[in-house]
Structures are given as structure tokens and as C-alpha cells.
């Protein structure tokens, strides 16, 4: 969480951004809020990116003005026009690219004053893992698959019964480059599993941590997956 203030004493307004992560090839949001103004026509929003000459996005006089937008953001950005009046300057970003990572500035002008705040935007790939029984294996095995990760993550297995056990000797993890030559498919197989146990496949890189659980009993199989962005925490 980053809170910025204007520089000129009483003519400053509070602008707040939230550090976030973008999933390559998906659509993302760069979060920014500010002290609202009564009149939409008095609000100017400028999004800038460090190292980029043109603007990322500009909104003024109640509408977008993309005259000075940098080519790399052409056709990819939008503010939530109906929410600007209540102080939401967040930016929608289409088709997130690795090169979108960096430091962004949300700069606001209203009738009350000016303010800005920086935002660190990380980009990578992350996806939910799915754990299934691996019927192809000779022994009772589990297969954990996640379709898109970048940078290359670590994969760790754990079990409820054997807490603290190291499964690296009885598991095999592979990374297969996807067709766009950036993200990778993660496949990890855990061998010699036992019934009446819950196993967890944990995939983590510097952007996200995902867990796939499977509970195997004689009568049923239960699965659960979760994903947490590591750099969204204030």
C-alpha cells in the first residue's frame, strides 16, 4: 500500500495505490484511489510508467485523451469512467506483457489540488494446480499439473500424515515451455502415496503461491486448490 501526497501544502490531495501483479496474457488492474471531487470535469488522471516516454493513459474533462499515449499501451488501457467521480483512478490493462512490469505513477489533479503515488507492478504467470491420481504410473502416484507459470517456480509436496517429511526423493518435477515461449507448464509426480491421507502440491515463485490438495480415502477423492499473490500484501 502506497500513499502519496501533493507537494504544495494545502493544495495537496491523498492518492493511494496498491502494489499488484499481472498475469501474462490476461487482463490486469493497476489500483489507484484519490480524494474525490464534485465535478468530473475538474478531474485529471495521468498514468505514467518509469522509462516510458509517452503516457500510459490520460483522462481529463470527463473523457479519455490518448493523444500522448505511448505506442506500447495503444488499445490496451481504460479507466472505470463511471467510478472516477467517487475517487477511483484504477487502470484496466489488457493482455499483460512481461515488459509491463515496472514502476507506475498515478498522478491526479482536482479542484482541491494535486497528488501522486507510485505503484510497483510485477508481471509473471501463475495458475491453479490440479492434483489427480496418476493411473499411468506403475505404483500409486499423484500428478500435480499447473498450465502456466513464470518465472520458473519451485514445487514442494507435503502430507498431513507425514508432516515435515521431505518428498523430494520420491517426486519428479518437470517444466514444459508453452507455445508462446515464455510461460511453462508445471508437472510434478509424487510416487508411493498411501490412502487415508491428504497431500498438498505447493507451487511458488516470487509473484504467487498456489496449492493443490487431494484427500485420498478408500471411498472418495476430494480436491481443493488455492492461489495467493505474494506481492499484494500491504
Amino acid at each position: 500500500l502506497i500513499i502519496g501526497f501533493g507537494i504544495s501544502g494545502r493544495h495537496s490531495i491523498t492518492v493511494t495505490t496498491l502494489t499488484s501483479a499481472g498475469n501474462i496474457g490476461e487482463d490486469g488492474i493497476l489500483s489507484c484511489t484519490f480524494e474525490p471531487d464534485i465535478r468530473l470535469s475538474d478531474i485529471v488522471i495521468q498514468w505514467l510508467k518509469e522509462g516510458v516516454v509517452g503516457l500510459v493513459h490520460e483522462f481529463k474533462e470527463g473523457k479519455d485523451d490518448l493523444s500522448d499515449q505511448d505506442e506500447m499501451f495503444r488499445g490496451r488501457t481504460a479507466v472505470f469512467t463511471d467510478q472516477v467521480i467517487v475517487g477511483n483512478a484504477s487502470l484496466r490493462l489488457k493482455n499483460v506483457q512481461l515488459t509491463d512490469a515496472g514502476t507506475y505513477k498515478c498522478y491526479i489533479i482536482t479542484s482541491k489540488g494535486k497528488g501522486n503515488a507510485n505503484l510497483e507492478y510485477k508481471t509473471g504467470a501463475f495458475s491453479m494446480p490440479e492434483v489427480n491420481l496418476d493411473y499411468n504410473a506403475s505404483s500409486e502416484s499423484l500428478r500435480c499439473e499447473a498450465p502456466r507459470w513464470f518465472p520458473q517456480p519451485t514445487v514442494v509436496w507435503a502430507s498431513q500424515v507425514d508432516q515435515g517429511a521431505n518428498f523430494s526423493e520420491v517426486s519428479n518435477t518437470s517444466f514444459e515451455l508453452n507455445s508462446e515461449n515464455v510461460t511453462m507448464k508445471v508437472v510434478s509426480v509424487l510416487y508411493n502415496v498411501t490412502v487415508n491421507n491428504t497431500y498438498s502440491c505447493m507451487i511458488e515463485n516470487d509473484i504467487a503461491k498456489a496449492t493443490g490438495d487431494i484427500k485420498v480415502t478408500d471411498s472418495e477423492i476430494k480436491r481443493r486448490s488455492s492461489l495467493q499473490l505474494l506481492n499484494s500484501r500491504a
Epitope: 496474457g25 490476461e26 487482463d27 473523457k63 479519455d64 485523451d65 490518448l66 493523444s67 500522448d68 499515449q69 505506442e71 495503444r74 488499445g75 490496451r76 488501457t77 481504460a78 469512467t81 484496466r92 489488457k94 493482455n95 507455445s179 508462446e180
Partner: antibody, heavy 120, light 107 residues
Framework: QLQLQESGPGLVKPSETLSLTCTVS??????????WGWIRQPPGKGLEWIGN???????YYNPSLRSRVTISVDTSKNQFSLKLSSVTAADTAVYYC????????????WGQGTLVTVSS | EIVMTQSPATLSVSPGERATLSCRAS??????LAWYQQKPGQAPRLLIY???TRATGIPARFSGSGSGTEFTLTISSLQSEDFAVYYC?????????FGGGTKVEIK
């Protein structure tokens, strides 16, 4: 409501330059949240996006046509234009102009289209 | 460029029946997809954008769904004016591309 109207010659000779103009009425071409695009459709076939322009003059073209395409804008006349050089019979198509959202980038509304035939 | 593939090429449906049209992208386009209707001699008309948001003035019988690479346009109960060609279009990345179209004809 906003309307778009294409105009230009319906017949162009091979190797010459196709020139079309789109006149926008019922709204300003300087509306900030939109690009202005050209799309074409060969007879009995599908749609192909040619490119777009912002009122400030910045353009983006389909790479397959980039070497032959120029799109320009005249805000004083509320018009934008397409030029396609070195045409061949394969460029025979109905040419549409349309308003294109800056994002989301859907096309709405469209002009009624004008058929351009390339033939000697 | 992203290739959009529509199926079937032709769909024969009786008035009042449901029509389901498919569109597949060669790579993920997230929800950045639009659907258009085109009648003979007319320009295309926007039906759906953002994969599932109906454009202004479009009847509720038209609905869009899907994300990533698989998309569907459903016409819940075909009216006589719905017989036309339907195109999907991705705007996820340049160049924007259209599918080859699905012709919905009277059975």
C-alpha cells in the same frame, strides 16, 4: 446518433492507389475514447481489419497490409481516410469504416460499406 | 496473429429453436471477444463485447459466454430476423482478427 458514411471511387485499376473517405456525423471524431478503423470484406468472404487512427493522428496498421496502407484524419471536416497503394484484384472488397473502442476494442457503429473493384 | 475458427460453417435451425454458435481462438484472448451479426447487403452489427456483455439495444435472447480460447454465442429462441451470418472477433492483440463466420439459415 452517430453515423459513418464511406465515399470514393468504386473502380480502381491494378497497381493504382485506392482512396476512400469516411465522414462521421452525429458526433465528434475528437471523442477521446475511440479510434476510427477500416475493415474490408472480399465478396462472399470474411472480415479483415485494416487499421485504425486516433484523432491526434497516431495510427496502427495490420502488419499484412502495413507497407501499402495510409490512414489519415481531418478533424476540421470530421473525416478520416484510407489509402491503399499498388492494388491488385485481391483487394477487391467491400470497405467499411467503423468507430473502434479504445478498450474494449469492439467496432460500433459501422458505415454501410462501399464496394471497390480492382480491374483494368 | 491469433486465428479465430468458427463452427459450424452453416447452422440450420427452425424458428423458435435455440442456436448455439462456437468460436475458438488459437491462443487465449481472455474475455476480449466480440460477436457481430451481418445480413445480406448490410454492414455487421455489434451484438456482444467482452465475451458476454450485450451491446446497447440487443435483445436478451442473444447471450455470449466463454473465456480463454472457447466462446459461445447462444440465441435462445430464433426469430425470423435472426437468420444471418455471425462473426466473432478477438481484440486481445494486434492485429485484430475475425472468425470465418457461421451462417444461420432456416431449417
Amino acid at each position: 446518433q452517430l453515423q459513418l458514411q464511406e465515399s470514393g471511387p468504386g473502380l480502381v485499376k491494378p497497381s493504382e492507389t485506392l482512396s476512400l473517405t469516411c465522414t462521421v456525423s452525429g458526433g465528434s471524431i475528437k471523442s477521446g475514447s475511440y479510434y476510427w478503423g477500416w475493415i474490408r470484406q472480399p465478396p462472399g468472404k470474411g472480415l479483415e481489419w485494416i487499421g485504425n487512427i486516433y484523432y491526434s493522428g497516431s495510427t496502427y496498421y495490420n502488419p499484412s497490409l502495413r507497407s501499402r496502407v495510409t490512414i489519415s484524419v481531418d478533424t476540421s471536416k470530421n473525416q478520416f481516410s484510407l489509402k491503399l497503394s499498388s492494388v491488385t484484384a485481391a483487394d477487391t472488397a467491400v470497405y467499411y469504416c467503423a468507430r473502434e473502442g479504445s478498450y474494449p476494442n469492439q467496432f460500433d457503429p459501422w458505415g454501410q460499406g462501399t464496394l471497390v473493384t480492382v480491374s483494368s | 496473429e491469433i486465428v479465430m475458427t468458427q463452427s459450424p460453417a452453416t447452422l440450420s435451425v427452425s424458428p423458435g429453436e435455440r442456436a448455439t454458435l462456437s468460436c475458438r481462438a488459437s491462443q487465449s484472448v481472455s474475455s476480449n471477444l466480440a460477436w457481430y451479426q451481418q445480413k445480406p447487403g448490410q454492414a455487421p452489427r455489434l451484438l456482444i463485447y467482452g465475451a458476454s456483455t450485450r451491446a446497447t439495444g440487443i435483445p436478451a435472447r442473444f447471450s455470449g459466454s466463454g473465456s480463454g480460447t472457447e466462446f459461445t454465442l447462444t440465441i435462445s429462441s430464433l426469430q425470423s430476423e435472426d437468420f444471418a451470418v455471425y462473426y466473432c472477433q478477438q481484440y486481445h492483440s494486434f492485429p485484430f482478427t475475425f472468425g470465418g463466420g457461421t451462417k444461420v439459415e432456416i431449417k
